[in-house]
């Protein structure tokens, strides 16, 4: 079982990762970001479900579509470039979720922007955050 | 065949603790997420906690801090410590089994924490 | 956290009847819904999830739709053994939270 330790640990790696996403959420809502309106076409895939650890899978599989509509972007909107943002998101999830290899993703049949997809992994970071005992 | 049965329920009272045990069987018990959830009487559904496969726990303010989520994967039972009890603790205390992508999937049949003086 | 606001909160329905019932979340939750059966002094079962997936061995009247915030249960032909109360529920995110319940009573 998890001790205190670890659970402050996996807190603070989710706070991390939040930070992250919030960031490059922010970059591309920025008013200046001309190229928006098509990133806003790309479609990503939500996970079926994401209350769990073990359901960070599902983001993980989508970095690599997020990273290539990232490029997109300007480049001034993010402190890192995409690539780096996205490794340094890959190595955090990959801490979170463990290394279960068997478990696999299962997607809502809707698709997402990449406003909406951001904003529902933000949303698990805080619940995550706020219900972990 | 799934089955969850739930014991530990009884008459306590308020600052009084309590320990409801589920104990699981006909499915992979260390392979899913468990919770609990209550039912005051004559009122809806209330989450009360969850224990993820990791034994990673997830409860909401109402009761973080009193409860105790926990499980023993050897012995298939999960576990809740109720702690600094309430009268608005009153309720049927029920385990259920969380699916990996869907909803609560399982349900034992309650027991009933009754806290008064 | 995310409400769930179910109504009508009781209705008096014969059998062979056709009934809906509603449930409205305060965001989007992405089809993550169920719905539960709950008879009088007994636990639970679960109909429908996801939010329109029937639950093995849920007959086939039972039937869940919706998206967005707007989800609702549907019961083609109400039998007498589906005389009950029945509660929604989002799984999208923790603290998972249910509907305040429809008590469904013979008319």
């Known amino acids: 079982a998890p001790t205190s330790s670890s659970t402050k640990k996996t807190q603070l790696q989710l706070e991390h990762l939040l930070l992250d996403l919030q960031m490059i959420l922010n970059g591309i809502n920025n008013y200046k970001n001309p190229k928006l309106t098509r990133m806003l076409t790309f479609k990503f895939y939500m996970p079926k479900k994401a209350t769990e650890l073990k359901h960070l899978q599902c983001l993980e599989e989508e970095l690599k579509p997020l990273e290539e509509v990232l490029n997109l972007a300007q480049s001034k909107n993010f402190h890192l470039r995409p690539r780096d943002l996205i490794s340094n998101i890959n190595v955090i999830v990959l801490e979170l979720k463990g290394s279960e290899t068997t478990f696999m993703c299962e997607y809502a049949d809707e698709t997402a922007t990449i406003v909406e997809f951001l904003n529902r992994w933000i949303t698990f970071c805080q619940s995550i955050i706020s219900t972990l005992t | 065949e799934v089955q969850l049965v739930e014991s530990g329920g009884g008459l306590v009272q308020p600052g009084g603790s309590l320990r409801l045990s589920c104990a699981a069987s006909?499915?992979?018990?260390?392979?899913?997420?468990l919770a609990w959830v209550r039912q005051a009487p004559g009122k809806g559904l209330e989450w009360v906690a969850a224990?993820?496969?990791?034994?990673?726990?997830y409860s909401p303010d109402t009761v973080r801090g009193r409860f105790t989520i926990s499980r023993d994967n050897a012995k298939n039972s999960l576990y809740l410590q109720m702690n600094s009890l309430r009268a608005e603790d009153t309720a049927v205390y029920y385990c259920?089994?969380?699916?990996?992508?869907?909803?609560?999937?399982?349900w034992g049949q309650g027991t009933t924490v009754t806290v008064s003086s | 956290d995310i409400q769930m606001t179910q109504s009508p909160s009781s209705l008096s329905a014969s059998v062979g009847d056709r009934v809906t019932i509603t449930c409205k979340v305060t965001e989007k939750v992405w089809g993550n819904v169920a719905w539960y059966q709950q008879k009088p002094g007994k636990a639970p079962i679960s109909l429908i999830y996801s939010p329109s997936l029937r639950k093995s061995g849920v007959p086939s009247r039972f039937s869940g739709s919706g998206s967005g915030t707007d989800f609702t249960l549907t019961i083609s032909s109400l039998q007498p053994e589906d005389f009950a109360t029945y509660y929604c529920?989002?799984?999208?995110?923790?603290?998972?939270?249910f509907g305040g319940g429809t008590k469904v009573e013979i008319k």
């Open positions: 529920q989002q799984y999208y995110t923790y603290p998972y939270t």
């Open positions: 224990i993820d496969s990791s034994s990673y726990t």
């Open positions: 006909g499915f992979t018990f260390s392979s899913y997420t």
């Open positions: 259920a089994r969380d699916s990996n992508w869907d909803a609560l999937d399982y």
